[in-house]
């Protein structure tokens, strides 16, 4: 766009002798600038297209030469389960809901000490339009929340089988499942055990070797022949989910303050929020940097607190 600027200056120079430029000349100059602008925009568009094409053209597939690596040690797993399972864990913290009643506001400061200061001052006079309103600052009384770890283990030895038809007696179906899932032609392998639940039409198949489950799971279905009818059962990964470190916590928010005493105000909530924000931004009012303000002048609102 620098070029654009230079061209404009050039045109201005050509048409700007020291003498006074008349209206006609002025109009002509604007027209010329507009034309030049359109021309430049087209040129930019063309160059951008070319650039995109060039980018595609210059994307290269490089065969990186083989690197010789020196293995210093072999990590021996403590037990077989490290090989037979894929583990992952998730930390889950619930958000704690708080209902802001009519005439209340929540203000969150960037710093804890500012929030504490605002609470300790308790009474604050906030100018809202032509009203000098006295609001009370209190800590936010929060309900209890929960925090826990979800520990997921995906087995490399087991699979879930569902949609098993109820066409055989339990012992026979167990044998039939083992027989079918041991067929290498279908990606199966030696079966260690079959846990079959006739009622739910599901089973857990445990294989002897690692890798068989992965092979079977490449397809979502598996053939199960019973008296010449091919039933297609559904296969899915076998996962075990454990809940760990379940904690219930409660307390008060360190950076958020509850403001009460705004019941009589009939104004737009956003305007009031801005005014509260402005008031509490000022150090002379005992405030500091504000993160967010949420005000309820009509219907109660739900605010969610998280760690």
């Amino acid at each position: 766009m620098e070029a654009d600027k230079d061209d404009t200056q050039q045109i201005l120079k050509e048409h700007s002798p020291d003498e006074f430029i008349k209206d006609e000349q002025n109009k002509g100059l604007i027209d010329e600038i507009t034309k030049k602008n359109i021309q430049l925009k087209k040129e930019i568009q063309k160059l951008e297209t070319e650039l995109q094409e060039a980018t595609k053209e210059f994307q290269i597939k490089e065969d990186i030469p083989e690197t010789k690596m020196k293995f210093l040690s072999v990590e021996t797993p403590e037990n077989d389960s490290q090989l037979s399972n894929i583990s992952c864990s998730f930390q889950v913290s619930s958000k704690v809901p708080y209902e802001i009643q009519k005439g209340q506001a929540l203000i969150t400061f960037e710093k804890e000490e500012v929030a504490q200061n605002v609470v300790s001052m308790s009474k604050h006079h906030v100018q809202i339009k032509d009203v000098n309103l006295e609001v009370t600052a209190k800590p936010v009384p929060l309900n209890s929340g929960v925090r826990f770890q979800v520990y997921v283990e995906v087995s490399k030895m087991k699979i879930n089988v569902t949609e098993i038809p109820d066409t055989l007696r339990e012992d026979q179906m167990r044998d039939k499942l083992e027989l079918s899932f041991s067929k290498s032609r279908n990606g199966g392998g030696e079966v260690d055990r079959v846990d079959y639940d006739r009622q739910s039409g599901s089973a857990v198949i445990t294989f002897v070797e690692i890798g068989v489950a992965d092979k079977i799971l490449k397809k979502k279905e598996y053939p199960l022949y019973i008296n010449q009818t091919c039933h297609r059962v559904t296969v899915s990964p076998y996962t075990e989910i454990h809940l760990k470190k379940y904690q219930i916590f409660s307390g008060t928010s360190k950076r958020t303050v509850l403001l009460t005493g705004m019941e009589g105000i009939q104004m737009d909530e956003e305007i009031v929020e801005d005014l509260i924000n402005i008031h509490f931004q000022r150090a002379k009012n005992g405030g500091g940097e504000v993160d967010v303000v949420k005000c309820s002048l009509g219907q109660p609102h739900i605010a969610y607190f998280e760690e």
Epitope: E178, K183, Q228
Partner: antibody, heavy 124, light 112 residues
Framework: QSLEESGGDLVKPGASLTLTCTAS?????????MCWVRQAPGKGLEWIAC????????TYEASWAKGRFTISKTSSTTVTLQMTSLTAADTATYFC?????????????????WGPGTLVTVSS | ALVMTQTPSSVSAAVGGTVTINCQAS??????LAWYQQKPGQPPKLLIY???NLESGVPSRFKGSGSGTEYTLTISDLECDDAATYYC??????????????FGGGTEVVVK
């Protein structure tokens, strides 16, 4: 691959006897049932019992054999048949046979491997 | 219980001829039928499984057919070596009963 029966003998009525079938060249797996079939002199084949060679070891007996004949898997290459309260009608050649599953495209079975048989004679 | 009825009990034919053995099941066996050949003093030998599939090494002169409850074994171009007793057999999975297994009564084939 072969099967061999042992334990056949001449016993008195009311006696018990255990027959053993030993597999060579293969070990039991999920693809078959190991079975016992008998044949009385000059008569036809009669199915006695089968045991699934897979992990469950499910057993199936002919209705007439229930309670008197028990099939069991004693190792990955041996199957036994325990017979009690034997009578003259139980005199026969007892075959051990492998019932194989041809179920790649269907639910087909066949006794594709047999032992030579062992003779059991029940006589006073 | 599963019952297999085999007919005839005996059949004779000349070398080069054809014999047909029938087998009837007491219930639908869904083509899960096998045929065996047994010679005196020997264990049976599997010829056909799944009603019509030839076991490896078995000559194509042996042909199985049928479905439902009716099955047939046809031996064509009879040879002296085909003289034996032939048995049909089926095993069946069930929803209500034990897995059943049964043999037919046998058919003696005499080659003249």
């Amino acid at each position: 691959q072969s099967l061999e029966e042992s334990g056949g003998d001449l016993v008195k009525p009311g006696a018990s006897l255990t027959l053993t079938c030993t597999a060579s060249g293969f070990s039991f797996s999920s693809s078959y049932y190991m079975c016992w079939v008998r044949q009385a002199p000059g008569k036809g084949l009669e199915w006695i019992a089968c045991i699934y060679a897979g992990s469950s070891g499910s057993t199936y007996e002919a209705s007439w054999a229930k309670g008197r004949f028990t099939i069991s898997k004693t190792s990955s290459t041996t199957v036994t048949l325990q017979m009690t309260s034997l009578t003259a009608a139980d005199t026969a050649t007892y075959f051990c046979a492998r019932e194989y599953s041809y179920d790649d495209y269907g639910d087909f079975w066949g006794f594709n491997l047999w032992g030579p048989g062992t003779l059991v004679t029940v006589s006073s | 219980a599963l019952v297999m009825t085999q007919t005839p009990s005996s059949v004779s034919a000349a070398v080069g001829g054809t014999v047909t053995i029938n087998c009837q099941a007491s219930q639908n066996i869904y083509t899960n039928l096998a045929w065996y050949q047994q010679k005196p003093g020997q264990p049976p030998k599997l010829l056909i499984y799944g009603a019509s599939n030839l076991e490896s090494g078995v000559p194509s002169r042996f042909k199985g057919s049928g479905s439902g409850t009716e099955y047939t074994l046809t031996i064509s171009d009879l040879e002296c070596d085909d003289a034996a007793t032939y048995y049909c057999q089926s095993s069946l999975y069930s929803r209500i009963a034990d897995r059943a297994n049964a043999f037919g009564g046998g058919t003696e084939v005499v080659v003249k």
